[in-house]
Interface confidence: low
């Protein structure tokens, strides 16, 4: 499987207040990446 430890499902303000610039031109935050992996690992 994907490996990696489980993380709490983080909320990220960028997710709700996204602009064209913010998703592609700001660096992906560490919390953001953890959140996605938590969701995908947890969905199996």
């Amino acid at each position: 499987g994907g490996g990696g430890s489980k993380h709490k499902c983080f909320r990220n303000s960028l997710e709700n207040n996204e602009t064209l610039e913010s998703i592609m031109n700001t660096l992906e935050s560490e919390e953001d990446f953890r959140k996605y992996f938590y969701y995908l690992e947890g969905s199996k």
């Epitope: 990696g4 998703i23 992906e28 953001d32 996605y36 969701y39 969905s43």
Partner: antibody, heavy 118, light 112 residues
Framework: QVQLVESGGGVVQPGRSLRLSCAAS????????MHWVRQAPGKGLEWVAV????????HFADSVKGRFTISRDNSKNTLNLQMNSLRAEDRAVYYC???????????WGQGTMVTVSS | DIVMTQTPLSSPVTLGQPASISCRSS???????????LSWLQQRPGQPPRLLIY???NRFSGVPDRFSGSGAGTDFTLKISRVEAEDVGIYFC?????????FGPGTKVDIK
């Protein structure tokens, strides 16, 4: 400018190993997840693997699971794909790609060709 | 795995005329965060893929506004309002909602 350059492709016999590398420049490499995607000659795209920004999370396509490993060296801005037990069906151009938020593959390298042949 | 299908697989178009490509997923691409992770990529002959559209309808930086994306759930469309010579190539849809990430088979766009 933002750039990804793959290397390490070549001709290898079935069952042997090959290590691909991807050199990143023009962005903060340590802040992005990175992917490998491959494309067999004349065929479509197949996602291979992803590694998180810190290297702690990895995920693989079933077709390569247990044979390929993905790693990164953030101090050298380098992504690697170690390919073991290569098969004829692994013959493809291998692209590295940057993963933006939501795993959007926004920047792609030019690719490196891997040929598996006896 | 989520299976992505595209129609048509080949689309001969006239310069200056519109073109439309459909992409369908075998299950909904809406993730629990409310976002739909459907992208469109262009691959010109002899070139690597290039991101055009992300999250259904958002144009990536530098992509001409003649490209637009729409859709929801399992059905998505890429439209080119007026095809130019540089638009020749293969167009792929891709989902990054669920592992393993998967691509459509591609639609070849060429000039009549």
């Amino acid at each position: 400018q933002v750039q990804l350059v793959e290397s390490g492709g070549g001709v290898v016999q079935p069952g042997r190993s090959l290590r691909l590398s991807c050199a990143a420049s023009g962005f903060t490499f340590s802040s992005y997840g990175m992917h490998w995607v491959r494309q067999a000659p004349g065929k479509g795209l197949e996602w291979v693997a992803v590694i998180s920004y810190d290297g702690n999370n990895k995920h693989f396509a079933d077709s390569v699971k247990g044979r390929f490993t993905i790693s990164r060296d953030n101090s050298k801005n380098t992504l690697n794909l170690q390919m073991n037990s290569l098969r004829a069906e692994d013959r493809a151009v291998y692209y590295c790609a940057r993963g933006a938020s939501g795993f959007v593959l926004d920047i792609w390298g030019q690719g490196t060709m891997v040929t598996v042949s006896s | 795995d989520i299976v992505m299908t595209q129609t048509p697989l080949s689309s001969p178009v006239t310069l200056g005329q519109p073109a439309s490509i459909s992409c369908r997923s075998s299950q909904s691409l809406v993730r629990s965060d409310g976002n739909t992770y459907l992208s469109w990529l262009q691959q010109r002959p002899g070139q690597p893929p290039r991101l055009l559209i992300y999250k259904i309808s958002n144009r990536f930086s530098g992509v001409p506004d003649r490209f637009s994306g729409s859709g929801a759930g399992t059905d998505f469309t890429l439209k080119i309002s007026r095809v130019e010579a540089e638009d020749v190539g293969i167009y792929f849809c891709m989902q990054t909602t669920q592992f393993p990430f998967t691509f459509g088979p591609g639609t070849k766009v060429d000039i009549k």
